[in-house]
């Protein structure tokens, strides 16, 4: 007659007489004169099917009413809620002695769902039910009715189902509602783990251990477990799940991070707004994409802002000291949003005639404190060549410079080292030897260290051992030494001079003049 009624989530109804459409049609014994199915009107003028008996005149009443078969549905313990009205015997004059104010509740387990008769001896008594003072006042047909509610439980049950029976022993009673239910711990999500509907144990004190499964888009941190208590309440949650990267907990679910938010790891944190200079265009981002021109270093956390390479250093000053240069500069105007700024020095040696033709300086040049990864804004460069054009670039770098090597990041200066005494001449040759002369030629020093103003040739007879020598000066890289004695060994040294002075003499070249008037042409250092 009435639709499904709403009961607590932890109760599963197996029978509800108030929800049965039409007549209940339970079995009564005796068939006549005992329990009778009667419709009464509730507060909404809707008929309620009740069972009534009021045989208060005769002694030794034994009126039975049996429900239809009730499936157990796997429950081991069931609860019977009876709402009933019991008439006070005092309101029925002349029935003292025969009128009772209790009835008895029985059950019988059976696998047979079609037992047609009541066999009283098969039934097991659950309890004697009496009206107590804890009644509820309910409107029935525009008047207040005292409605008693009694709940009993029975178990453990093992067969497929069971029957309930009500034995009247002479009361004036109406069964207004009979509800049979079992308790379960309802499907729930706790600590992001889902625990299924779980039927309570057979015992009123038993706990059923249940393992939970992580909700979608989450993973176990510790094994999630809970215990289902006999009253249908979940107890003692242990362990938990964490939302995967790109997801956060919302309403007991792991939901994707919204656009503009991200979450990098499986943690219990919420999604965070994308850091400065980054964005996410999809839901469920585990990191945010850097804006154009901004980057994230390999070891930068996803939570760090995207950064960019620094701008060029400022105010580069050079100070040349002979073949050393001291450079100083200021930090860049824009560090790119990073703290890990450092500086690299690039040294290029450039031709005097064409400054665009530059080559790396090579390993002979030394840098103090170092060439790369400088943390200070100064460097000293030594062991340069004198009188040479050098271009020095100071590069400002940070953790993301490698992603965008932009020339704007460096500042450069071109200097020329001071002139110095030239290096020694590596190779001196006797080109022509006669009885009285020697024609010499040589190469420019490896390091002229300036403009070669002249070359000086020193020579002496070998046996004089430099006690008496002569000097010849020439601007050319060759000269004829005349007025020599025939058949005599001479030693020749050549050195170059710049404005800064003379360089070292070359290694000695020993040459012996001829005895005959013929010419000998040689290129060795020890012509004879």
């Amino acid at each position: 007659v009435t639709g499904s009624r709403v009961y607590p989530a932890n109760e599963v109804t197996l029978l509800d007489s108030r929800s049965v459409q039409g007549e209940l049609g339970w079995i009564a014994s005796p068939l006549e004169g005992g329990w009778e199915e009667v419709s009464i009107m509730d507060e909404k003028n809707t008929p309620i099917r009740t069972y009534q008996v009021c045989n208060v005149m005769e002694p030794s009443q034994n009126n039975w009413l049996r429900t239809d078969w009730i499936t157990r549905e796997g429950a081991q313990r069931v609860y019977i809620e009876i709402k009933f009205t019991l008439r006070d015997c005092n309101s029925l004059p002349g029935v003292m002695g025969t009128c009772k104010e209790t009835f008895n509740l029985y059950y019988y387990e059976s696998d047979n769902d079609k037992e047609r008769f009541i066999r009283e001896n098969q039934f097991v008594k659950i309890d004697t039910i009496a009206a107590d003072e804890s009644f509820t006042q309910v409107d029935i047909g525009d008047r207040i009715m005292k409605l008693n509610t009694e709940i009993r439980d029975v178990g453990p049950l093992s067969k497929k189902g069971f029957y309930l029976a009500f034995q009247d022993v002479g009361a004036c009673i109406a069964l207004v509602s009979v509800r049979v239910f079992y308790k379960k711990c309802p499907l729930t999500v706790r600590n992001l783990a889902q625990f299924p509907d779980t039927i309570t144990g057979a015992d009123t004190s038993s706990l059923v251990e249940v393992r939970g499964s992580c909700v979608n888009n989450s993973e176990e941190k510790d094994v999630p477990k809970m215990y289902c208590g006999a009253d249908g309440e979940w107890l003692v949650p242990i362990g938990n799940c964490l939302c995967n990267a790109g997801h956060e907990e919302r309403s007991g679910e792991c939901q994707a991070c919204k656009i503009g938010y991200y979450k990098a790891l499986s943690t219990d944190a919420t999604c965070a707004k994308c850091p400065p200079h980054s964005y996410s265009v999809w839901e469920g981002a585990t990191s945010c994409t850097c804006d154009r021109g901004f980057f994230r270093a390999d070891n930068d956390a996803a939570s760090m802002p995207c950064t960019r390479p620094p701008s060029a250093p400022l105010n580069l000053i050079s100070n040349v000291n002979e073949t050393s240069v001291n450079l100083e500069w200021s930090s860049p105007q824009n560090t790119g949003g990073r703290q890990d700024i450092s500086y690299n020095v690039v040294c290029k040696k450039c031709g005097a005639g064409d400054p665009s033709k530059c080559r790396p300086c090579g390993s002979g040049v030394h840098y103090t404190p170092q060439q790369n990864g400088l943390k200070t804004t100064k460097v000293s460069i030594t062991d340069l060549l004198a009188h040479t054009n050098y271009t020095f670039e100071i590069w400002a770098v940070n953790g993301v410079s490698k992603y965008n090597p932009n020339p704007d990041q460096s500042v450069s200066v071109t200097v020329t080292t001071n002139q110095a005494a030239p290096s020694s001449i590596a190779l001196v040759q006797a080109k022509e030897v006669t009885r009285y002369s020697v024609a010499l030629a040589w190469l420019e020093p490896d390091r002229p260290n300036g403009v070669i103003l002249e070359y000086e040739v020193k020579y002496y007879e070998k046996d004089q051992n430099e006690r008496s020598y002569r000097i010849v000066r020439t601007a050319a890289r060759n000269t004829d030494i005349k007025g020599l004695n025939p058949l005599t060994s001479y030693v020749f040294h050549v050195r170059a001079r710049t404005a800064a002075g003379y360089g070292d003499f070359s290694e000695p070249l020993e040459v012996t003049t001829n005895t005959v008037p013929s010419r000998i042409i040689g290129d060795g250092a020890n012509s004879t």
């Epitope: 029925l92 002349g94 109406a174």
Partner: antibody, heavy 121, light 106 residues
């Protein structure tokens, strides 16, 4: 089928007595109380009282004590109303009616056809 | 003793119309009264008893309601066989009837 059968009309002189039988059939006589109701000509119904058919214990309404007696013979499932010292104002139809007790209230669910008792000199 | 007063004494209705009969108690009663129908020359017939329950064979156009001291019998659509006298009856340690309402054809 449940019925209550009453005797035919009675004409009595003032001061006389009358015993009106009500025979029950179709149910267990001792399981239901029996009530008596009077209806004077052209008047409404008056409840006279009832008798516990199991114990024989009667209950009389105000105004129906003394001259009115309810009795039983359970062996023949019959209830009796005896009126003594009849008066002209006792002229009425007398009904027996089976009482139905319920949790929610009582009523008389089966009625006899009534016995007209006329008191006239 | 509780006195029941019925009104109106006579109610004129046409077949198919709704009829509403009133029964007022001299003091508050805990239960709804029973209602009876009596046609001329016949014994009364129980219509409705405890908690507004219709007696066996009574059509559902008859219904009863009320609480405390004011009670009502309603015939939703009067049929020709419904023209009769109607009595309310209060029960308890002592039972009393109302004086009756006659429902007649308009």
């Amino acid at each position: 089928q449940v019925q209550l059968l009453q005797s035919g009309a009675e004409v009595k002189k003032p001061g006389a007595s009358v015993k009106v039988p009500c025979k029950a059939s179709g149910y267990t006589f001792t399981s239901r109380a029996m009530s008596w109701v009077r209806q004077a000509p052209g008047q409404g119904l008056e409840w006279m009282g009832w008798i516990n058919t199991n114990t024989g214990n009667p209950t009389y309404a105000q105004g129906f004590t003394g001259r009115f007696v309810f009795s039983l013979d359970t062996s023949v499932s019959t209830a009796y109303l005896q009126i003594s010292s009849l008066k002209a104002e006792d002229t009425a139809v007398y009904y027996c009616a089976r009482v139905r007790f319920t949790v929610y209230g009582d009523g008389m669910d089966v009625w006899g056809q009534g016995t007209l008792v006329t008191v006239s000199s | 003793e509780i006195v029941l007063t019925q009104s109106p004494a006579t109610l004129s209705v046409s077949p198919g119309e709704r009829a509403t009969l009133s029964c007022r108690a001299s003091q508050s009663v805990s239960s709804n009264p029973a209602w009876y129908q009596q046609k001329p020359g016949q014994a009364p017939r129980l219509l409705i008893y405890g908690a507004s329950t219709r007696a066996t064979g009574i059509p559902d156009r008859f219904s009863a309601s009320g609480s405390g001291t004011d009670f009502t019998l309603t015939i939703s659509r009067v049929e020709p066989e419904d023209f009769a006298v109607y009595y309310c009856q209060q029960y308890g340690p002592s039972w009393t009837f109302g004086q009756g309402t006659k429902v007649e054809i308009k």
